[in-house]
Interface confidence: medium
């Protein structure tokens, strides 16, 4: 039977009819203990005939009286089957059983949905002893019910290792609809369909859903929960929510903003972190992402030379970490630099252009075709070379550095000469006769000294030994890290 307790839960009759120890008598219980641990020992007294049980698990006692009559089966008495009440109301329900006093060590426990209720529940077991039986009433009360209290409650009693189980008492807590799934904020592509989901539950069921867009209802007729709203596409931001209705009233979901994806705003604050002869390290602050994650960024570099035709070098990089080293630039050059970033919709406009300059660098290659002659008549060594390619000087050539090392038995001395930038030959005095002179040349800019050429050796004979054969740079080896010309 379903007993409705809409606004108030009243105690229900514990037994179908009078019996010794029934609450319909004026007996005061001999003992009343709070059900703190989930188990209560039953106090046993001399037996009387219990009232007839209805349903539930039954224990058939094997003990017989003096006349050898079997005792009747034990069972919990039938009680209310279904209690319906509103959230936050109080409820009390119980189960009862009459137990012959011959039984020892009986315990009653409460279970909900298959799990034993232990601890912090308000359960009381009361004992009403008589000559032959003891009526045991186990009460369970909840002062303010919540949805989580919904479920099937039963009593269990153990007697002589037998388990007796009561009929279930179904507690149904009704209230306003409760959302189990609410619409989520989304970022969507313009004019592209998308779905929103709303789900709410009672009891009471059914729960009906209305959709609301920008404060206006979308559907005239409600849909049963769960509901999926298909929006064919938006051209501007909108706020959606859903209303859930049941017999108890209305609950409104959170409002969610649906944003329209757009191209990002341009990056701001592009700044120069470091500059070398061939590279510039820049950083930037990304603009607004247009409701779509940045994918990558493009650094655009153009020569800030009035005579240049404005063509742009493009370097692509990941969107993070908002830092990029632009390499392979020319030394001592001016550049305009802009940054643009993209998301799935497209590229942002370019940031404001900034001006940056590379510094002067040391030359990247040595002078070429170094040749050394001995001019014995004047006791000089003539050195000739070709200047490095202009584009590999990495700055304004200020001259050359010549290293000449003189080695003879037990002697080695190195001398350095500086030559002006217009020279491509030099003359040095013979320092030691009957010795080897090793010559190397490096180009020099304000950015530093470039690499020295491969060594060229010439033997300086003792006086009177004529040898005019020139020495020149050997073919460079394959490990040379620059273009060999």
């Amino acid at each position: 039977a379903i007993t409705e307790a809409r606004e108030e839960a009243k105690p229900y009759p514990l037994f179908p009819g009078p019996f010794p120890g029934s609450l319909q008598t004026d007996h005061t219980p001999l003992l009343s203990l709070p059900h703190a641990s989930g188990y209560q020992p039953a106090l046993m007294f001399s037996p009387t005939q219990p009232g007839r049980p209805h349903t539930g698990n039954v224990a058939i006692p094997q003990v017989t009286s003096v006349e050898s009559k079997p005792l009747p089966p034990l069972a919990f008495k039938h009680t209310v089957g279904h209690i319906i009440l509103s959230e936050h109301k109080g409820v009390k329900f119980n189960c009862s059983i009459s137990v012959p006093n011959i039984y020892q060590d009986t315990t009653i426990s409460w279970w909900k949905d298959g799990k034993e209720l232990l601890g912090a529940h308000h359960a009381i077991t009361q004992f009403y002893p008589d000559d032959e039986v003891t009526a045991i009433i186990a009460s369970f009360s909840i002062t303010s019910v919540q949805r989580s209290d919904n479920g099937s409650y039963i009593c269990k009693m153990k007697i002589n290792n037998e388990e007796i189980v009561s009929d279930p008492i179904y507690i149904e807590v009704q209230g306003l609809p409760h959302f189990t799934k609410q619409p989520e904020s989304m970022n969507v592509t313009r004019n592209t369909a998308f779905n929103l989901t709303c789900q709410a539950v009672g009891p009471p069921e059914p729960v009906n859903i209305f959709w609301v867009q920008n404060s206006s209802r979308v559907n005239e007729q409600p849909e049963k929960s769960p509901s999926v709203l298909t929006v064919p596409g938006l051209t501007e931001m909108a706020v959606f929510s859903c209303e859930a209705h049941n017999d108890k009233g209305l609950t409104v979901s959170k409002g969610v903003q649906i944003n329209i994806k757009a191209i990002p705003s341009p990056p701001t604050e592009v700044s120069i972190r470091n500059s070398t002869a061939h590279s510039i390290l820049i950083s930037w602050v990304p603009g607004f992402d247009g409701y779509s994650p940045f994918r990558n960024c493009s650094i655009q570099v153009k020569e800030a030379d009035p005579l240049s035709n404005g063509s742009v070098m493009i370097f692509n990089t990941s969107a993070l970490p908002h830092l990029y080293q632009i390499k392979q630039l020319q030394a001592l050059a001016n550049y305009s630099i802009g940054v643009s970033c993209m998301n799935e919709i497209g590229w942002s406009a370019v940031s404001p252009w900034i001006l940056a300059s590379t510094t002067e660098g040391a030359p990247s290659v040595a002078p070429l075709n170094v040749t050394v002659f001995l001019n014995e008549s004047s006791d000089n060594v003539d050195i000739r070379w070709m200047k490095p390619p202009t584009k590999q000087q990495d700055g304004e050539l200020v001259g050359y550095r010549i290293s000449h090392v003189w080695q003879s038995a037990g002697i080695s001395k190195e001398l350095l000469e500086e030559v002006g930038q217009n020279g491509s030959r030099a003359r040095i005095s013979v320092q030691v006769h009957n010795a080897t002179c090793t010559v190397r040349i490096a180009a020099v800019t304000r950015g530093g000294v470039g690499p020295f050429s491969d060594p060229v050796k010439i033997f300086i004979p003792a006086h009177g030994w004529v040898d005019y054969a020139p020495s020149s740079t050997p073919a460079p080896g394959n490990a040379d890290p620059v273009l060999i010309i």
């Epitope: 240049s308 063509s311 392979q328 390619p389 202009t390 584009k391 394959n478 040379d480 273009l483 060999i484």
Partner: antibody
Framework: QVQLVQSGAEVKKPGASVKVSCKAS????????INWVRQAPGQGLEWMGW????????KYNEKFKGRVTMTTDTSTSTAYMELRSLRSDDTAVYYC?????????????WGQGTTVTVSS | EIVLTQSPDFQSVTPKEKVTITCSAS???????FHWYQQKPDQSPKLLIK???NLASGVPSRFSGSGSGTDYTLTINSLEAEDAATYYC?????????FGQGTKLEIK
């Protein structure tokens, strides 16, 4: 976008000279080398040399030294390659290419090619 | 002069197959100086891969390159009909700049 547009086909007699032009656009002409590469019918690619338009610095393949001259006109962003004393084995398609300037030397853009036929 | 030798000279392949072209150099070359080009019939060559393994702009990801020292490889995964062309390797290590003799790829 970067473009290299070459002059039209030429037919020459042995011993004559030919001058092929290559007009560059879409980038700073003086920043990159212009290289010349040729391809004889049914054959592979052969590098002839480069010129650096900013200062006219040239580097030629020894095979063509004395017969080839590369020049540029920066005012019109045009490069020229002249090959003298033509022989029948100079019959080829001549390409101008942009040499990437980072000394790792590759050719990132190519002209459409100019067919030079040497025949008596 | 650095001589580049490609293998094979010619290859006939069915679509979706994997193709490998090798290029052997007569001297050791740093991988930064090694590049590949594609030339379709009656067209100019086109830069395909620079610095051994970096795809040039617009080149499909089915192309890849690898190698070091003297041995370099161009690989085409899952060949497509449009890949019918002659492929050349090139070194930028020393003058004269040189190319391999080419590998002609025919689609069956």
């Amino acid at each position: 976008q970067v473009q290299l547009v070459q002059s039209g086909a030429e037919v020459k007699k042995p011993g004559a000279s030919v001058k092929v032009s290559c007009k560059a656009s879409g980038y700073t002409f003086t920043t990159y080398d212009i290289n010349w590469v040729r391809q004889a019918p049914g054959q592979g690619l052969e590098w002839m040399g480069w010129i650096y338009p900013r200062d006219g610095y040239t580097k030629y393949n020894e095979k063509f030294k004395g017969r080839v001259t590369m020049t540029t006109d920066t005012s019109t962003s045009t490069a020229y390659m002249e090959l003298r004393s033509l022989r029948s084995d100079d019959t080829a398609v001549y390409y101008c290419t942009r040499g990437y300037y980072d000394n790792l030397y590759y050719f990132d853009y190519w002209g459409q090619g100019t067919t030079v036929t040497v025949s008596s | 002069e650095i001589v580049l030798t490609q293998s094979p000279d010619f290859q006939s392949v069915t679509p979706k197959e994997k193709v490998t072209i090798t290029c052997s150099a007569s001297s050791i070359i740093s991988s930064n100086y090694f590049h590949w080009y594609q030339q379709k019939p009656d067209q100019s060559p086109k830069l395909l891969i620079k610095r051994t393994s970096n795809l040039a702009s617009g080149v499909p990801s089915r192309f890849s390159g690898s190698g070091s020292g003297t041995d370099y490889t161009l690989t085409i995964n899952s060949l497509e009909a449009e890949d019918a062309a002659t492929y050349y390797c090139q070194q930028g290590r020393s003058v004269p700049l040189t190319f391999g003799q080419g590998t002609k790829l025919e689609i069956k």
